[in-house]
Interface confidence: low
């Protein structure tokens, strides 16, 4: 009778560095000591008639056991293979370009340490949840690669390295590790320089808007511009409108940077650069500056009007023109009445680069005089009639501006000067208008003829 | 010395989201690992998930899976757990804390950030 | 889920008398790898939990020793020798054998 060794469990898997029940039994009556030949370390547990039990312990790769044992002086054997998975230790994908030219071929490197049995692991490179590359682990470490052509739906996308252990036929399921994702940065710069738009002329010490432009840029947002005069930073305001970028800032010139000057952009993606460059003249251009001798004069006193600018700028005033550029224009007036408020108008022209710029300016002279009171205004007398309206019409001129008051002779009885008055019979009788300032009085008699009231 | 300083207290509407960071110092931040776990007012401790911030592999408990996430910013050492569809027994102190290896004890906690989900 | 029973939940000491608390796993807490992952957490008035003993018997550095903890497979224990003042708090055992990670619900030492 032919006798079996049975070993349990038979070709069990198991997780690496796992520990395992080994069963070694017979059904021959008169079996000796089972024996267990193994390499792992194995320790017995328990035997009787026909059975003995083991632990295999840190079970670290594939093994075979072998149960042997003699029946009736005959040696009969058993075995069982072991299978040992283990996931992977590291599952790594490669640092990606900082930035990536769309339209060009990029790399995609995953490394795997670890991971067995080898011919059940495969590792998939993937871009968001789309697989790019499946292919099996071999060496060790398991190196994968794929070739990836980046297009702009590229920018952003997170990717990643996926290992699969399918441990699905020996009824364990299938163990997936991922990497840490990368992120990839894809552009596009155009090999087209900027647009710039600044000024040709910039006086010291004032403002002007220079713009640089840019279209067919992509990630427009992530664009780095640097806008300059000569050596000085200018600070932009960055614009973004789909694929097209604006700098805006403010061009200041200092006096230090007088002549001929460069304004300079520079647009900067994926570490490639565009430039553009205009050429622009700083000037100087003081004034004009109009001066009174006496800004505040006296009637009959002399004043004497000058206008004045920088070097190369020629000044004309109130249409007298300057002997030469950069010298002053003058001129000299008996200060009377007339003249109070009387406006000196000065241009001045500056030429820059054969352009000719102008400004102007002017200056209002004050003379002081005293009060008076013009008759041709006031009427002396004035044939009213009782209980009607009516406004006197009296004006008053001087340097300062004079007060006029009219009180009736002999009383303290004041009219409204300008201002229309319910006359009565009351009024009748002569008034003095007096017109008073710091200056002096002038005082002019009115009388008023009040026509009593008919009842018929 | 290692310290887990985490963001300030939250005070959310039902369905909303919250964010709450936790930025690690004085140990390399990729070496270890990041645990979150909450504490309803009066209640005991509730684990919710972990992070590997070197490979940025995570684990969540069942309890809240959909609704957690967690991330990793290594490039400033901060951790982040958000999570949405917030619910009135969500209110409770939330603790971000590290482990060294799997699977070892939560050695280092954050100071905690309370999160309140009232309408 | 691994279910961490504590007991008792409520524990008034007397300030150096011994103090002991047991905790015990609904499922064996060895690891594959053969270690015990129980551990041990205080959470002090006011304060964040803070580790005292790691991995059953492990006392994290800093930590008094006269806190210890014993224990195998599924039946755990912690162990004040003399209770001090300072001890006052919840304590938590919690696994980290099997995922998710769980907590015992807390024990309250206070004061008599």
């Known amino acids: 009778q032919e006798f079996l060794l049975r070993v349990e469990p038979q070709n069990p898997v198991l997780s690496a560095g796992g520990s395992l029940f080994v069963n070694c039994s017979t059904d021959c009556p008169s079996s000796e000591k089972i024996a267990l030949e193994t390499s792992l370390s194995k320790e017995l547990v328990a035997s009787g008639m026909g059975w003995a039990a083991f632990n295999l312990s840190n079970v670290t790769g594939n093994s075979r056991i072998l149960c042997s044992v003699y029946c009736n002086g005959s040696q009969i054997t058993g075995s069982s293979n072991i299978t040992v998975y283990g996931l992977p230790e590291r599952v790594e994908l490669a640092p990606l370009p900082p930035w990536q030219p769309v339209g060009q071929n990029f790399t995609l490197r995953c490394q795997v340490e670890g991971g067995s049995p080898r011919t059940s692991l495969t590792v998939v490179l993937l871009r968001w949840e789309e697989e790019l590359s499946r292919q099996p682990a071999v060496e060790e470490p398991a190196e994968v690669t794929a070739t990836v052509l980046a297009s702009r739906d590229d920018h952003g996308a997170p990717f990643s390295c996926r290992t699969e252990l399918d441990m699905q036929p020996q009824g364990l399921g299938l163990f997936v590790n991922t990497s840490a994702p990368r992120q990839l940065r894809t552009f596009v710069l155009p090999v087209t320089p900027p647009r710039l738009v600044a000024p040709r002329f910039l006086e010291v010490e004032t403002s002007w808007p220079v713009d640089c432009t840019l279209d067919g840029l992509f990630p427009a947002s992530e664009a780095q511009v640097y806008l300059a005069l000569g050596d000085q930073m200018l600070n932009a305001t960055v614009m973004n409108h789909g694929d097209t970028l604006t700098a805006t800032a403010t061009a200041t010139a200092r006096a230090d940077q007088e002549g001929a000057r460069e304004i300079v952009c520079n647009v900067t993606l994926g570490g490639e650069r565009r430039e553009a460059r205009e050429n622009l003249t700083v000037f100087s251009f003081l004034g004009p500056i109009v001066n009174l001798s006496e800004p505040t004069a006296h009637e009959g006193s002399t004043v004497t009007v000058s206008c004045m600018a920088g070097a190369r700028v020629q000044v004309t005033l109130d249409g007298v023109p300057a002997a030469a550029p950069g010298q002053t224009a003058q001129l000299q007036l008996n200060a009377t009445e007339s003249d109070d408020g009387r406006s000196f108008f000065c241009s001045a022209t500056l030429e820059v680069d054969g352009e000719f710029l102008h400004r102007n300016s002017s200056v209002q002279l004050r003379v002081l005089y005293g009060p008076k009171i013009d008759r041709a205004t006031c009427p002396q007398h004035l044939k009213w009639k009782d209980k009607t309206r009516h406004v006197l019409q009296c004006q008053a001129r001087g340097n300062p501006y004079p007060e006029l008051r009219c009180l009736k002779e002999g009383s303290s009885r004041e009219v409204p000067v300008g201002i229309p008055f319910f006359v009565n019979v009351t009024h009748n009788g002569t008034y003095q208008c007096q017109a008073s300032s710091s200056r002096g009085k002038y005082t002019l008699v009115v009388v008023m003829d009040i026509e009593a009231f008919s009842s018929h | 010395q290692v310290q887990l300083v985490q963001s300030g207290a939250e005070v959310k509407k039902p369905g909303a989201s919250v964010k709450v960071s936790c930025k690690a110092s004085g140990y390399t931040f990729t070496d270890c690992i990041i645990l979150w776990v909450r504490q309803a007012p009066g209640q005991g401790l509730e684990w919710m998930g972990k992070i590997n911030p070197y490979f940025g592999t995570t684990t969540y408990a069942q309890k809240f899976q959909g609704r957690v996430t967690i991330t990793a910013d290594t490039s400033t050492s901060t951790a982040y757990m958000e999570l949405s569809s917030l619910r009135s027994e969500d209110t409770a102190v939330y603790y971000c804390?590290?482990?060294?290896?799997?699977?070892?004890?939560?050695?280092?906690w954050g100071q905690g950030t309370l999160v309140t989900v009232s309408s | 889920d691994i279910v961490m029973t504590q007991s008792p939940l409520s524990l008034p000491v007397t300030p150096g008398e011994p103090a002991s608390i047991s905790c015990r796993s609904s499922q064996s807490l060895v690891h594959s790898n053969g270690d015990t992952y129980l551990h041990w957490y205080l959470q002090k008035p006011g304060q964040s939990p803070q580790l005292l003993i790691y991995?059953?018997?492990n006392r994290f550095s800093g930590v008094p020793d006269r806190f210890s903890g014993s224990g195998s497979g599924t039946d755990f224990t912690l162990k004040i020798s003399r209770v001090e003042a300072e001890d006052v708090g919840v304590y938590y055992c919690s696994q980290s054998t099997h995922v998710p990670y769980t907590f015992g619900q807390g024990t309250k030492v206070e004061i008599k």
């Open positions: 804390a590290r482990k060294e290896a799997y699977p070892d004890a939560m050695d280092y």
């Open positions: 991995k059953v018997s």
